[in-house]
Every structure is written in structure tokens, then in C-alpha cells.
Interface confidence: low
Amino acid sequence: EVEKTACPSGKKAREIDESLIFYKKWELEACVDAALLATQMDRVNAIPFTYEQLDVLKHKLDELYPQGYPESVIQHLGYLFLKMSPEDIRKWNVTSLETLKALLEVNKGHEMSPQVATLIDRFVKGRGQLDKDTLDTLTAFYPGYLCSLSPEELSSVPPSSIWAVRPQDLDTCDPRQLDVLYPKARLAFQNMNGSEYFVKIQSFLGGAPTEDLKALSQQNVSMDLATFMKLRTDAVLPLTVAEVQKLLGPHVEGLKAEERHRPVRDWILRQRQDDLDTLGLGLQG
């Protein structure tokens, strides 16, 4: 807390400008009107305040807006956002994607902080669903964002948003999350032709059921081993040797290297040895 002291004569701030960087903390508190600060937040843009001075500016805004800052102020917070606590952010009503982007930029290159997580939560709840533009923005800043959501939260992602998802966005997703995302992806990409469809659906296949894998095996897709190894074990087990051969195409030889790992190991144990021998890979059931 900064003590309440009278502003020295002639030091009352008439606008937010660079002269303020020479003010001591108590002078900022006494001489800068909070309403002026709020209306000229964008002017703070290029002023090299110290972090201690930023604390004073935050304190002034907190006093002016005890119920939470308006979006016109939030959009121009910049580095002041790094001073906010999750409790502060929970009071906000952020509806503009531009505001969200401006604040995410400030934290860019860092792990998702509790402040950012709270901000995103407030924003998404305010919108009611993870629409495409929001998802596009969030995954651009945090590629792992999608996989940090619970299956319940993912259920609010509309299929149209799936177009914004890149393969790397799904790297850390577990099977339960892919179970939710896969049907949405199938719906999103349903009008694409075979080869294009497979390119798009490939990263979601960890949520695919057996019937879909069987259908893919009829389309000369040449699935790579990395994708095959991420498939659900229960979806792979019912596939025949012929179906797996068709599904993998030239990559079928990779099964030998993966024979001790799931789902290949479990699948091998389910097959007749005669069928496995047709692959000529020396796989032992």
C-alpha cells in the first residue's frame, strides 16, 4: 500500500506521458488521477515504467474499478497484465478476441500462467463455446492448449473449429480426449476426398473405432507406424492381418520393430500364426 500524501505543487499529471517515469511511487499515487489513467491506458504503451511504478498504477486502477476493470482498460493493459492475479481476472468480462490476443501476446513464449489460464477460462465461458477464431488464437499461442482441456470441456468445441487444429496441437492429448475430438473431426472433414481426408483426419485417429479403421484400410492410405501406434488398442485388436497390411501399405514392415509394444503386441497375440506368416516379417503370435 502506498501512503496517501498530497500532490506537490505543479506535479499534478494532466496527461499520461514520459515525464511520469521520474515520479516517485508516492508521487504517482498522489498526482495521477485514476480516471485519467484509465482513459489514457494506450498512452502507457511506450513509457518505460519500473515494475514498482506499475504496482502503483495497478493499485490506482483497482481503487477505481473494485468490481473489475472494463474491457476498454483491459485491452490496453500490456505488461500490467503480468501484475494481475487470477482473482483480479475473475472479475473481468472479456468478450473481444482482440483483447484476448493483446493479453496473450504479453505472455508469449512463456508457459501458460495461472493468470492466462483464468483469462482463457473467462473468455471461453463468456462465449459459451470454443469457436473457430478463439481456438485458432489459443492454439497459435499455446499449441498444447486443446489437450489441457477435459473431455467435458472439449465437448463444447463445434466441429467447424476442428479446421483450426494442427497435428502438433494434439501431441499431448490422451485417448479420452481424442475420443471426443475424433467424431467432430470426422464430421468436419466429411466432404473431403479420400487422400485429403486422410491427411486431415490422421492426427485424430487415436479416437477412431474399429469400423472406421476397417474402412480406411480399403482406401490405400499407407498409414505410418507413428500413427498406428497411437490407435486405441481395443480398436486395433479386431482388425485382420489383411486389413492391417492394407492400412499400413509399405509401412507394414515397421510392425517388426514394434512387436513388443502396444497395440502391436496385443494385436499379434490375437492373430493366427498362419496369417502372421503371410506378412513375411517373422512375427510370433
Epitope: 514520459e18 504503451n45 515504467f49 500490456g78 497484465f81 501476446e105 504479453v106 508469449k108
Partner: nanobody, 126 residues
Framework: QVRLVESGGGSVQAGGSLRLSCAAS????????MGWFRQAPGKEREAVAG????????YYADSVKDRFTISQDNAKNTVYLQMNSLKPEDTAMYYC???????????????????WGQGTQVTVSS
């Protein structure tokens, strides 16, 4: 991806001048602050001067005020550092840096720098 390429370093006598250039390529959208840090052998990397590229507002470390001038050429996406009255203590590797400045162009710490150049050596002899 942003790439920063410095040039203009070299050796000079005390009291002399040098002009460093930093050309940025790639999507600079959002990285509003560009400028220079330096690192002398065995010392921490420190901010020298920065500029808010849209507005031309500047930041200088106390040690270089009134001697160094930072400027920009928006058309060329290039930032310049004019160094006059050079002193032996200005000897260091000078690095161009780009960092995001949404509200505060606080160029004084390297923590929030997103991109660095490879560096250009400046040597000032007495």
C-alpha cells in the same frame, strides 16, 4: 519466424563513432520494441537502447544517454544505433533484440525478449 541480422560493428579509438544496423525479416507483427543489448566478457547482458517501432518512442540506458541515438527505417524494417563519443567501457558484443511491447516499452531486461540477432563486436581502444 523473425530473423535479425546486425552489421556495422568494428574497432575504433575512444571518442570515435560507429553506426550499427539491425535488419529484421519475417513477421514482426506484435514485436513492437526493437533495439540493442550488449554483453562484455564476464558480464551480464544489458539493455542499451530500444525503440517502439510504430511511434518512434525511445528508451536509453543511463550509461549511453546523450551519446547513443536509436532510430528506425520502417520501410526497410531496420533499426540503427548511432554511437558517438565511444569509451573503452562500451567494448562488448552488441545484440539486436525484438520484444513485444503492448503497454510498456520497458526495454531494460532481457527476460521478455523474443528474438535475438547473432551479435556484432564493438571494440573501443583508449
Amino acid at each position: 519466424q523473425v530473423r535479425l541480422v546486425e552489421s556495422g560493428g568494428g574497432s575504433v579509438q575512444a571518442g570515435g563513432s560507429l553506426r550499427l544496423s539491425c535488419a529484421a525479416s519475417g513477421d514482426m507483427n506484435g514485436y513492437k520494441c526493437m533495439g540493442w543489448f550488449r554483453q562484455a566478457p564476464g558480464k551480464e547482458r544489458e539493455a542499451v537502447a530500444g525503440i517502439y517501432t510504430g511511434r518512434g518512442t525511445t528508451y536509453y540506458a543511463d550509461s549511453v544517454k546523450d551519446r547513443f541515438t536509436i532510430s528506425q527505417d520502417n520501410a526497410k524494417n531496420t533499426v540503427y544505433l548511432q554511437m558517438n563519443s565511444l569509451k573503452p567501457e562500451d567494448t562488448a558484443m552488441y545484440y539486436c533484440a525484438a520484444k513485444y511491447c503492448a503497454v510498456v516499452a520497458e526495454f531494460g531486461g532481457p527476460r521478455l525478449v523474443r528474438y535475438w540477432g547473432q551479435g556484432t563486436q564493438v571494440t573501443v581502444s583508449s
